[in-house]
């Protein structure tokens, strides 16, 4: 059962796993959620009745029954992990904590103009977990405006104390705001010989890389495959770090693979979600339960629905035994990974999908692309919405893209003459416009947020957000698309599609079926040559064939230019403007979404 509210002046008795320090009960709840075993927690707030050494302690707890006895205690705040909830979770914490000193290893000290600059420095430093900044009112003159970057083994402070005129906060790497290089390569036959901070068992290098990414101290990893000569090290995932943040020594070794933490590529890749099945593989761990199941998929479902289950092994039924049902072993361990991995015993193993909600929903697999043809099929572009106006009569106005459960990203120029959000309707999961009848459900629009520098499409800033009145429940036919990550700014996208119900030629009508066209990106330099009378800025991106023939057109505005990279779809552009439609040497011009990620996050995450 999902319980989100916090219990004031309440302490859970027993079940302690570990104690960490957090600046707030809210953040304690996040830490509990991300801990492999924590189901409940008790946080101690600052209080005159409480021993100051216990202030800001966050005690992480577990219980077989998923609850613990409650005791009244002043200044204690208790609650449950979000593991039991189905809503999306994020580790992103932008809060700044005033008059708190978060203790850790101070490894870098420099002068900064503001707390924001200090936080940016922390976000762009590979080792930094959190920071403390002495404001210009700090009593000690030589420490004023000093930005201390800090790290710890756990990623959380080792202690938190009250200190006047300082502020503290966390790195925003988990908010996808780091400018650090995103290094996606996995190197075969390679061992990184730097110091190990931890080791876990993993079925493949991809899982090892994902574990490294969400481990607070891991910067790169080495994985020994099941063919590794030393038997005791097979399937071993070594989590590593170095002072420079980069591997210092690379050794060529067969049957080993190495790679990097993807912390600065966050939101573009699944990090917590290990969705594959591993055949002829047994995961060992503490046994939680053994249940009958028809298939390994059913076993994974059972594991996902059991809040304490972390991974499973399914042994298929022997012929005609137990109504064709096999045995599903639900398992757990102290760190969420198997304690040992065995091969050749006929089991099928995998992980809970409960943690998938900690990844951005947009990274989950969708229907494979239908190659060829111009009409889309249902579920092919589940982020695409049709935006209707009801005034003077109801009609399709523009396209748009779902980027969050209450947010649509579209073009600012769509709202010329739109006086109020009340006349707008957003329809999702639609393939044919003819499906939209009077009784078709839609989302009302609560607010239209147009970029304040927008004047006209051709001069840029052609971007707008719609805040919906109600939240979108994600399904196969309506789900979000990922925003491009700033760490991926230099990716060259080669698989880009424009979609919409717009005209198929300049003088035409809105199409009934959602149309799609694969269109290559064009460099801004090339695009500028085609539009001598306009300034093509870096905040724009162009796409089109030199010979024309395929393009967005009237009615497609606001819709997505969707590009697939590393099996994940990204919203690279918003259909904005162009000269005519599909004309020779006149590419379409799109709003370059990566340049507006900060603006989008600022608007969608504003309290």
């Amino acid at each position: 059962e999902c319980v989100t509210q916090l219990l004031k002046d309440t302490c859970f008795e027993g079940g302690d796993i570990t104690t960490v320090f957090t600046p707030s009960a809210k953040y304690c709840q996040v830490v509990c959620t991300y801990h492999p075993r924590c189901l409940l927690f008790t946080f101690t707030a600052e209080s005159p009745s409480e021993d100051p050494t216990r202030w800001f302690t966050c005690v992480l707890k577990d219980s077989v029954t998923e609850t613990l006895p409650r005791v009244n205690r002043t200044a204690a705040i208790s609650g449950y992990s979000f593991k039991q909830c189905s809503h999306q979770i994020s580790a992103c914490n932008k809060d700044i904590y005033v008059d708190l000193d978060m203790k850790g290893i101070n490894y870098n000290s420099s002068v900064a103009k503001s707390a924001q600059e200090c936080q940016e420095r922390c976000t762009d430093d590979v080792h930094c977990h959190f920071f403390t900044y002495a404001t210009r009112q700090f009593p000690s003159l030589e420490h004023r405006n000093i930005c201390l970057l800090k790290h710890t083994q756990t990623g959380t402070p080792t202690r938190i104390t009250k200190l006047d005129k300082v502020v503290s906060g966390f790195s925003l790497k988990s908010c996808a705001l780091s400018n650090l290089a995103c290094i996606r390569d996995i190197f075969p036959n390679t061992v990184f010989a730097d110091s190990n901070i931890d080791s876990v068992m993993a079925p493949d290098a991809f899982v090892c890389g994902r574990i490294c990414t969400h481990h607070p101290g891991c910067l790169f990893f080495t994985f020994f495959s099941q063919e590794w000569p030393k038997e005791s090290q097979r399937n071993l995932c070594l989590l590593k770090t170095s002072e420079s943040g980069l591997p210092s020594t690379r050794i060529k070794k067969s049957k080993a693979l190495s790679g990097f933490s993807l912390q600065s590529c966050r939101h573009s890749i699944p990090v917590f979600c290990h969705s594959s099945f591993y055949h002829d593989t047994d995961f060992l761990g503490e046994e939680l339960d053994i249940v009958a199941a028809k298939s390994h998929e059913a076993c994974q479902k059972l594991c996902t629905n059991a809040v304490r289950c972390q991974f499973f092994t399914y042994t298929p039924a022997q012929a005609s035994c137990n109504e064709g049902k096999g045995k599903c072993y639900l398992k757990l361990s102290s760190n969420g990974s198997p304690t040992k991995i065995l091969h050749g015993r006929g089991g099928i193993s995998g992980y809970t999908l409960r943690l998938c909600k900690m990844d951005n929903e947009c990274t989950t697999k969708i229907k494979p692309r239908i190659v060829g043809g111009t009409a889309s099929v249902r579920g092919e572009w589940p982020w695409q919405v049709t935006l209707h106006t009801t005034s003077p009569t109801q009609r399709h106005l523009c396209g748009g893209s779902i980027i969050g459960n209450q947010w649509i990203l579209t073009a600012a120029h769509c709202f010329y003459g739109v006086e109020s959000p009340k006349i707008l309707r957003v329809y999702s999961g639609i393939l044919n416009q003819s499906e939209i009848k009077e009784d078709t459900s839609f989302f009302g629009v609560q607010e239209i947020i147009i970029h304040d520098q927008y004047k006209m499409a051709e001069s840029g800033y052609d971007i707008a957000l719609l805040k919906l009145e109600t939240t979108v429940n994600y399904t196969d036919s309506q789900r979000p698309i990922c925003l491009p990550s700033k760490g991926d700014r230099n990716v060259i996208y080669t698989d880009c599609w424009v979609t919409g119900w717009g005209y198929r030629k300049l003088r035409d009508k809105i199409q009934n079926t959602l149309q799609k066209a694969k269109i290559p990106l064009v460099t801004n330099e090339e695009c500028q040559k085609r539009y001598r009378g306009h300034k093509i800025t870096h905040k724009m991106i162009c796409a089109g064939y030199r010979e024309g023939g395929k393009d967005a057109c009237k009615g497609d505005s606001g819709g997505p230019l969707s590009c697939k990279h590393n099996e994940v779809w990204h919203l690279v552009g918003i259909t904005s403007w162009g000269e005519g439609c599909a004309q020779r040497e006149r590419p379409g011009v799109y709003t370059n979404v990566v340049e507006y990620v900060d603006w989008i996050l600022e608007k969608t995450q504003a309290v």
């Epitope: 762009d124 591997p247 690379r250």
Partner: nanobody, 124 residues
Framework: QVQLVESGGGSVQAGGSLRLSCAAS????????VGWFRQAPGKGLEGVSA????????YYADSVKGRFTISQDNSKNTVYLQMNSLRAEDTAVYYC?????????????????WGQGTLVTVSS
């Protein structure tokens, strides 16, 4: 003693090409980030391109994407910047820099070692 030496600068007509080289001694490009930066007259330092030599991951400023290509020759401990379709606004002193940490690739503040620079002049 670390030394980075740039070469290959010069004067060229708009639309022309140049290839800059950066050779290192006392510092190995392998396992490190190497960046090209430029400073136009009266302007600040601007990140142009960078490479992480271990896997060859490359990074480019939007203003040069599609025109400039960064590459490496680990055996010669040299990094190259191939500049095509040059424009007047590419006129600047080009610097090669080496980082010893994981960095935001186009942020000059995080690079440790710097060359003396080579002048590129593009006339229209």
């Amino acid at each position: 003693q670390v030394q980075l030496v740039e070469s290959g600068g010069g004067s060229v007509q708009a639309g022309g090409s140049l290839r800059l080289s950066c050779a290192a001694s006392g510092y190995t490009f392998n396992n490190n980030f190497v960046g090209w930066f430029r400073q136009a007259p009266g302007k600040g330092l601007e990140g142009v391109s960078a490479i992480y030599s271990l896997g060859g991951s490359t990074y480019y400023a939007d203003s040069v994407k599609g025109r400039f290509t960064i590459s490496q020759d680990n055996s010669k401990n040299t990094v190259y910047l191939q500049m095509n379709s040059l424009r007047a606004e590419d006129t600047a002193v080009y610097y090669c820099a080496g980082a010893i940490t994981w960095v935001p690739p186009l942020s000059h503040r995080r690079y440790t070692y710097w060359g003396q620079g080579t002048l590129v002049t593009v006339s229209s």
